[in-house]
């Protein structure tokens, strides 16, 4: 399956809309950074198939989407700016859908990429729960932006090689 | 507010298979992985296995795999789960469970089918 | 697969008595991923405790829990005639996700 060529161009959008959400300095809040534990061996996009790294992709990207939907969310950013986000990654989620479904009736979710999708859920969990423990404070939020650039450009790398691939 | 929807209850006879469903409601159905729960009268939960209404991705319990098939219908925003062969060990009540994270793992439950295997 | 183990399988307290339940688990689980659900007879199960010691919305101070690695426990306080249901402990720390049998916890 090919991603259009606009997937990347919703990339390198949605990782600018992220970039100007930024409230508060990053440096006012460096007591509260936190190590994540970005699942990166899951996207350095080696050990497993194009038609795997898709599905991983794809849970990335969703849960992205669904940190971003929530009241809390709401509250923590300027309205238009999250709303042109979620748009971004909404049609991202559409293309890498289109993907994934093709190989559904081809093979069930291999035995590598269930625990991919694992690491991914879990490093999302961790970012649930620094948000609870910190009861969604601006620092909290402006921390979970930055780690989230981070990981959007790790999954627009692993998308530029799967593209080198083809 | 989120509600997964599930018939009472389903008679079937030793042998033959069975199509569970779940209709969810309040939330964006496509955008949380729905899970399928197993408790038989009296006993534990035993997970049987998860599907991404997105694109149909399913992950199973290797216990249930030859037992139990996930699918979805987006148009109806329903999850279903065919189970076959069905046998007295299969007399349960099955949920289904809304996956998401930290208080919002499986913080949403249907009330649960029970599956009586009965001649 | 990870076997959760719960202790005991019945248990009986007076209004006020202060009770702990117990889950061991047959390898580590990361505390983020063990979950504790409250189930009474006829209902579905509804989430209790996440990531180990977080109560759920709705759920009384009264309850708390801990742990970490292959031993986790929930508490309770006082004893409350609400209190009486069957508690689940649920791990989805590695594939198959699995619970425990349950502790089936009675108001004397």
């Known amino acids: 399956c090919d991603l259009p060529q606009t997937h990347s161009l919703g990339n390198r959008r949605a990782l600018i809309l992220l970039a100007q959400m930024g409230r508060i300095s990053h440096f006012s809040c460096l007591k509260d950074r936190h190590d994540f534990g970005f699942p990166e061996e899951e996207f350095d996009g080696h050990q497993f198939q194009k038609t795997q790294a898709i599905s991983v992709l794809h849970e990335m990207i969703q849960q992205t989407f669904n940190l971003f939907s929530t009241e809390d969310s709401s509250a923590a950013w300027e309205q238009s700016l999250l709303e042109k986000f979620s748009t971004e990654l909404y049609q991202q989620l559409n293309d890498l859908e289109a993907c994934v479904i093709q190989e559904v009736g081809v093979e069930e979710t291999p035995l590598m990429n269930v625990d991919s999708i694992l690491a991914v859920r879990k490093y999302f969990q961790r970012i649930t729960l620094y948000l609870t423990e910190k009861k969604y404070s601006p620092c909290a939020w402006e921390v979970v932006r930055a780690e989230i650039m981070r990981s959007l450009s790790f999954s627009t790398n692993l998308q530029k090689r799967l593209r080198r691939k083809d | 507010q989120v509600q997964l929807q599930q018939p009472g209850a389903e008679l079937v006879k030793p042998g033959a298979s069975v199509k569970l469903s779940c209709k969810a409601s309040?939330?964006?159905?496509?955008?949380?992985?729905m899970h399928w729960v197993k408790q038989r009268p009296g006993q534990g939960l035993e997970w049987i296995g998860e599907?991404?209404?997105?694109?149909?991705?399913?992950i199973y319990n290797e216990n249930f795999k030859s037992k139990a098939t996930l699918t979805v219908d987006k148009s109806s925003i329903t999850a279903f789960m065919q189970l076959s062969s069905l046998t007295s060990e299969d007399s349960a009540v099955y949920f289904c469970?809304?996956?998401?994270?930290?208080?919002?793992?499986?913080?949403?439950w249907g009330q649960g089918t029970l599956v009586t295997v009965s001649a | 697969q990870i076997v959760l183990t719960q202790s005991p399988a019945i248990m009986s307290a007076s209004p006020g008595e202060k009770v702990t339940l117990t889950c061991s688990a047959g390898?580590?689980?990361?505390?983020?991923?063990l979950y504790w659900y409250q189930q009474k007879p006829g209902s579905s199960p509804k989430l209790w405790i996440y990531?180990?010691?977080n109560l759920a919305s709705g759920v009384p101070a009264r309850f708390s829990g801990s742990g970490s690695g292959t031993s986790y426990s929930l508490t309770i306080s006082s004893m409350e005639a609400e209190d009486a249901a069957s508690y689940f402990c649920?791990?989805?720390?590695?594939?198959?996700?699995?619970f425990g049998s349950g502790t089936k916890l009675e108001i004397k």
């Open positions: 469970a809304r996956g998401g994270l930290g208080p919002a793992w499986f913080a949403y």
């Open positions: 649920h791990q989805w720390s590695s594939y198959p996700f699995t």
């Open positions: 599907i991404n209404p997105s694109h149909g991705r399913t």
């Open positions: 990531s180990t010691s």
């Open positions: 390898s580590s689980v990361d505390s983020s991923y």
């Open positions: 309040g939330y964006t159905f496509t955008n949380y992985w």
